[in-house]
Interface confidence: low
């Protein structure tokens, strides 16, 4: 605790500028008037204080702004966003795309901390949603960010803001959140041509169901192993050969190289023989010519 | 009947580098359609899953182990190995060789090989 | 990725039914069908005695079944008798392709 000490003659604030780095702590708290801080906060960025004397003007605005700093303080902390903890962001009502952004950048090329995570929870829940341009901002400073919402949070994404997201947005997902975005971007690419339907679609297909993925081997869209092994495995295998060949078009050959890599591997464990044969790849584990077959996808819905 | 058998256990110090061999007998493991696996046995018995390795050559491996890990597939001896380098105390541990099948399933293990990591 | 959770113990007498419950996340046992059960006695290797949630191997017993609900999976032996003493390990296959194992129940017969 900094102690009470009554100002120096003559050294007053009467602004914020370059000469308080020269003041000592107890001197800033004696001598720097709060409100006057709060008004100038666009200044103490441009002045290179140490971090002692940041906790400083921390201290002051904090017994300033006991409920909270008001969001005209808040849009300029600058670096002093730094000296903040996720406790005194919480008391924070940050309405402004702008104010967000501001601070998103005090913290730009780091990995997101909890004071950033905190911010961001209490900007989005403000909000009520995800919406296009808080997502097309948080995945500039945070291309994980999406991935980083558990399906709950997800949920409340809106199709449109799916236009937004960049395939390497979606590059940490895992099959529940594709589960839930998947759907979202099928109503929002819905009224584009296949080609281009498919070049957006491409990175949400790893919550894509059966049906969906038999849909598109009937239009040509030559999908790519990367994309292919990110599928669900439950999707997968109940697609038949011929399916799975029109769904790859000329990239079938990569099967070969993936062949006892997941989900590729449980594939072929559940085709006939001859029918992977038939693909003139030499694949091999399908299920011998002869063998009786049984209905799987009974089975794994009686499992 | 095919039968899994693993050697090269014993006591390895702290840095060096584990070894084990697992030899398939009563069939071939070039057979399609089986994955010829890796998995430990802490002393507390957690069971942990290490990686598989295909009679192609292709493998997968657990990602906590993965920058440590080597496994390798020698047909015409009918074995498969196991290289994990730069080893630690939590490395001591029972390593079983398994076979699987569909469903991620293990249907033949081997008895397993106990190994000590200590200076 | 995390072990699954298994009661650390479980007892019955002969002749009773008993359940041994297995639970992962959405992202192992609730989000497929591939939760195996394995049987260890001590200084033995592991033994398989359910795959893909409820299918039994040939020479399994019947009174050895399998279930799912959810993100809990369960093993019930049913008629216990003494060999069935044993430590009971299940496992699943995991969103990261990846399998992950339980730490084991010790079941005791009385």
């Known amino acids: 605790e900094v102690e009470k000490t009554a100002c120096p003659s003559g050294k007053k604030a009467r602004e914020i500028d370059e000469s308080l780095i020269f003041y000592k702590k107890w001197e800033l708290e004696a001598c720097v008037d709060a409100a006057l801080l709060a008004t100038q906060m666009d200044r103490v960025n441009a002045i290179p204080f140490t971090y002692e004397q940041l906790d400083v003007l921390k201290h002051k605005l904090d017994e300033l702004y006991p409920q909270g700093y008001p969001e005209s303080v808040i849009q300029h902390l600058g670096y002093l966003f730094l000296k903040m903890s996720p406790e005194d962001i919480r008391k924070w009502n940050v309405t402004s795309l702008e104010t967000l952004k501001a601070l998103l950048e005090v913290n730009k090329g780091h990995e997101m901390s909890p004071q950033v995570a905190t911010l961001i929870d209490r900007f989005v829940k403000g909000r009520g949603q995800l919406d296009k341009d808080t997502l097309d901002t948080l995945t500039a400073f945070y291309p994980g960010y999406l991935c980083s919402l558990s399906p709950e949070e997800l949920s409340s994404v809106p199709p449109s803001s799916i236009w937004a997201v960049r395939p390497q947005d979606l590059d940490t997902c895992d099959p529940r959140q594709l589960d839930v975005l998947y759907p979202k971007a099928r109503l929002a690419f819905q009224n584009m041509n296949g080609s281009e339907y498919f070049v957006k679609i491409q990175s949400f297909l790893g919550g894509a169901p059966t049906e969906d993925l038999k849909a598109l081997s009937q239009q040509n869209v030559s999908m790519d192993l990367a994309t292919f092994m990110k599928l669900r495995t439950d999707a997968v295998l109940p697609l038949t050969v011929a399916e799975v060949q029109k769904l790859l078009g000329p990239h079938v050959e990569g099967l070969k190289a993936e062949e006892r890599h997941r989900p590729v591997r449980d594939w072929i464990l559940r085709q006939r023989q001859d029918d992977l044969d038939t693909l003139g790849l030499g694949l091999q584990g399908g299920i011998p010519n002869g063998y009786l077959v049984l209905d799987l996808s009974m089975q794994e819905a009686l499992s | 009947q095919v039968q899994l058998q693993e050697s090269g256990g014993g006591l390895v110090k702290p840095s060096e580098t584990l070894s084990l061999t697992c030899t398939v007998s009563?069939?071939?493991?070039?057979?399609?359609?089986?994955?010829w696996s890796w998995i430990r046995q802490h002393p507390g018995k957690c069971l942990e899953w290490i990686g598989y390795?295909?009679?192609?050559?292709?493998?997968y491996t657990n990602p906590s182990l993965r920058d440590r890990l080597k496994i390798s597939v020698d047909t015409s001896k009918n074995q498969f190995s196991l290289k994990l380098s730069s080893v630690t105390a939590a490395d001591t541990a029972m390593y079983y060789c398994?076979?699987?099948?569909?469903?991620?399933?293990?249907?033949?293990w081997g008895q397993g090989t106990m190994v000590t990591v200590s200076s | 990725q995390s072990a699954l959770t298994q009661p650390a113990s479980v007892s019955g007498s002969p002749g009773q039914s008993i359940t041994i419950s297995c639970t992962g996340t959405s992202s192992d046992v609730g989000g497929y069908n591939y939760v195996s059960w394995y049987q260890q006695h001590p200084g033995k290797a592991p033994k398989l005695m359910i795959y893909?949630?409820?299918n039994r191997p040939s020479g399994v017993s019947n009174r050895f079944s399998g279930s799912k609900s959810g993100n809990t999976a369960s093993l019930t032996i049913s008629g216990l008798q003494a060999e069935d003493e044993a430590d009971y390990y299940c496992?699943?296959?995991?969103?990261?392709?990846?399998?992950?194992f339980g730490c084991g129940t010790k079941l005791t017969v009385l």
């Open positions: 009563g069939g071939s493991i070039s057979s399609g359609g089986y994955f």
């Open positions: 496992s699943s296959y995991t969103s990261s392709s990846t399998l992950v």
């Open positions: 398994a076979r699987e099948g569909a469903g991620y399933a293990f249907d033949i």
């Open positions: 893909e949630v409820s």
């Open positions: 390795i295909y009679y192609s050559g292709s493998t």
